[in-house]
Amino acid sequence: GCLTQLYENAFFRGGDVASMYTPNAQYCQMRCTFHPRCLLFSFLPASSINDMEKRFGCFLKDSVTGTLPKVHRTGAVSGHSLKQCGHQISACHRDIYKGVDMRGVNFNVSKVSSVEECQKRCTSNIRCQFFSYATQTFHKAEYRNNCLLKYSPGGTPTAIKVLSNVESGFSLKPCALSEIGCHMNIFQHLAFSDVDVARVLTPDAFVCRTICTYHPNCLFFTFYTNVWKIESQRNVCLLKTSESGTPSSSTPQENTISGYSLLTCKRTLPEPCHSKIYPGVDFGGEELNVTFVKGVNVCQETCTKMIRCQFFTYSLLPEDCKEEKCKCFLRLSMDGSPTRIAYGTQGSSGYSLRLCNTGDNSVCTTKTSTRIVGGTNSSWGEWPWQVSLQVKLTAQRHLCGGSLIGHQWVLTAAHCFDGLPLQDVWRIYSGILNLSDITKDTPFSQIKEIIIHQNYKVSEGNHDIALIKLQAPLNYTEFQKPICLPSKGDTSTIYTNCWVTGWGFSKEKGEIQNILQKVNIPLVTNEECQKRYQDYKITQRMVCAGYKEGGKDACKGDSGGPLVCKHNGMWRLVGITSWGEGCARREQPGVYTKVAEYMDWILEKTQSSDGKAQMQSPA
């Protein structure tokens, strides 16, 4: 299953399959997730080690048993790959690292006014993998405001150095935010020239293209089909790059297929997994396990559940079957691709779905109309769980926010439905940033069921929580995916990085905003919060957030939206925007419904009709 916990001051001994430099443990975990053999990782922050060569070291590890002995090492951080973690699997990494220089091949230098602009340049440059930016206070005047675009053979820095007034980060191409755009075309009977960066075996050009998309240096590819004239080159997928970023030449060639990486696509990237099953094909590799199962789909499920399994072959040979069950060969290799592909067999083959980010049809967990004041514009894909709840009567208008918590579930505030309990009048927009982008052609979800907490009473602040079941399940993308829920009764976690988002008023007597707003707000203890509200009881089912001096808060139209906190690299839905005394007033924190206190209720209500809990727990 999915394991998200991080181990502080611990280092996994042995099992090394690769090492690299990464700026933090979360990026190291992401590299582990996408490495075909990595199950565990250990990261050494700069503060944890004196050896300059090992600072920022990210060590990727494998283990036959799925675990390794942990040794105490002050400052080290260890954890698990996020394979099997559904929607948490993403190559997108937005963080910017202050005081850090990520070294690599500097291929472009320009003057820019901010680190955000530098990151944008990197994202819009086909070869840029990461960047460094010298701020206005950098010690050497001639380097100030320099934006250095970089790449390296492995896509990670060749070294990371602590350096004042330098900020570094990664390209946002894996976030589907590139302005470059991509070539979806597949070119039959055409071979591209240029530099081969890797060679793998794949059953078709589509798998080849997905592997190219997620390979750090692949810009385009050529695939040799299973009828290619040279037998030893059949099913070979050549991953390629060039100085210019495009093929310098292409040659008409029978039984070859070429195409481009889809990393530069805007708004949608392919999933980092291959779900197709190939009948009459055997995939060769190192044997992990053999089990008898009923049908090829069960074989694929078995492979997906066994975390080390990369691909499988389901044999229909009479000697491999007994009754309705046949042998399911679970296999792996060094690069995650078959070492041999044979056609015309009595088998069916395919890949593990451990890196698919759709997951199951579940909601995600780990073991007064209010409002954004003092916020800033959000960017695409920053808060992919945020939805807009709109009402269409004569005109259509945004009324509340909500949070996507599963393919078919949205969590919001009960008071959003005060006076409007009819499900037909509601339209739910997901995967959007600007309300002005909504036209009559914009797809929206309709409500199948509104479930208001049984103890909620109109115009009271208590139990302000509601679930919405959508008529049809939503697919997950970089711009539309769920937020994880906290553990039941989560009281021990101290959240220090919390954000509220919404399209609500930007001042107390304002209007709905066009661009989704975000504001970083500290949590306030319930005891402190209670002292600020002389007439209302702040219960343990509420959580408060706000600045002593005011100025930043949620406001009208943000109700029902998320209060999310980042902990150990993972965002969790801590609160639902509920009520407050005005907006952003001094000494009047916003009051949010505490989601952890309603976990039993959420789980009970999101049970599917067959009684299977629609929850997926990464803890």
Partner: antibody, heavy 116, light 106 residues
Framework: EVQLQQSGAELVKPGASVRLSCTAS????????IFWVKQRPKQGLEWIGR????????KYDPKIQGKATLTADTSSNTAYLQLSSLTSEDSAIYYC?????????WGQGTLVSVSA | DIQMTQSPSAMSASVGDRVTITCEAS??????IAWYQQKPGQPPKLLIY???TLQSGVPSRFSGSGSGTDFTFTISSLQPEDIATYYC????????FGQGTKVEIK
């Protein structure tokens, strides 16, 4: 309209106990705290304690711990103050009040006279 | 325990006068002070909370100020209906009332 109706005056003997009631209307006591405050004749105000009727959590002034017991019955929307081992020092008006961080709305008070 | 020392215990002033009452806390109470008005035969009424926030429906002639341990309650222009006893209350740590100030008209 928010109202707190307190029980009538009590004349009790030293050493006895008394139970005062405070019945709420216009709101549900589960959604608030009920506070009790004592005011001796011609004297100031003293906080006795607070109850959260939703879960019966109580807080008392440490100086009077043991003298007072706070309870609530959510079905009748009523809070109670029980005073035990009464002495002349306990002769006072006892107020119930509702609120969150503070006592925002008050009952009319109940006079308790302790006399042999 | 936090003690609240209120002064004066009684005062008389003319209609239209500015009236000032002070409260001193034995510890810093983080501005968590409220002021109540009590008229004879009635329960107290909340006027001000969190040092200076006026409870809704309370006339603007009532105000509060201060920080740390020293706080002031002011009636900018005394009216006949303001004759009452005024109490300060700290609510930073449990609840403690001041001894009260009786305001009379000269």
């Amino acid at each position: 309209e928010v109202q707190l109706q307190q029980s009538g005056a009590e004349l009790v003997k030293p050493g006895a106990s008394v139970r005062l009631s405070c019945t709420a209307s216009g709101f549900n006591i589960k959604d608030t705290y009920i506070f009790w405050v004592k005011q001796r004749p011609k004297q100031g105000l003293e906080w006795i304690g607070r109850i959260d009727p939703e879960n019966d959590n109580t807080k008392y002034d440490p100086k009077i711990q043991g003298k007072a017991t706070l309870t609530a019955d959510t079905s009748s929307n009523t809070a109670y103050l029980q005073l035990s081992s009464l002495t002349s020092e306990d002769s006072a008006i006892y107020y119930c009040a509702k609120g969150g961080g503070l006592f925002a709305y008050w009952g009319q008070g109940t006079l308790v006279s302790v006399s042999a | 325990d936090i003690q609240m020392t209120q002064s004066p215990s009684a005062m008389s002033a003319s209609v239209g006068d500015r009236v000032t009452i002070t409260c001193e806390a034995s510890h810093d109470i983080n501005n968590y002070i409220a002021w109540y008005q009590q008229k004879p035969g009635q329960p107290p009424k909340l006027l001000i909370y969190y040092t200076s926030t006026l409870q809704s429906g309370v006339p603007s002639r009532f105000s509060g100020s201060g920080s740390g341990t020293d706080f002031t309650f002011t009636i900018s222009s005394l009216q006949p209906e303001d004759i009452a006893t005024y109490y300060c209350l700290q609510y930073d740590n449990l609840f403690t009332f001041g001894q009260g100030t009786k305001v009379e008209i000269k």
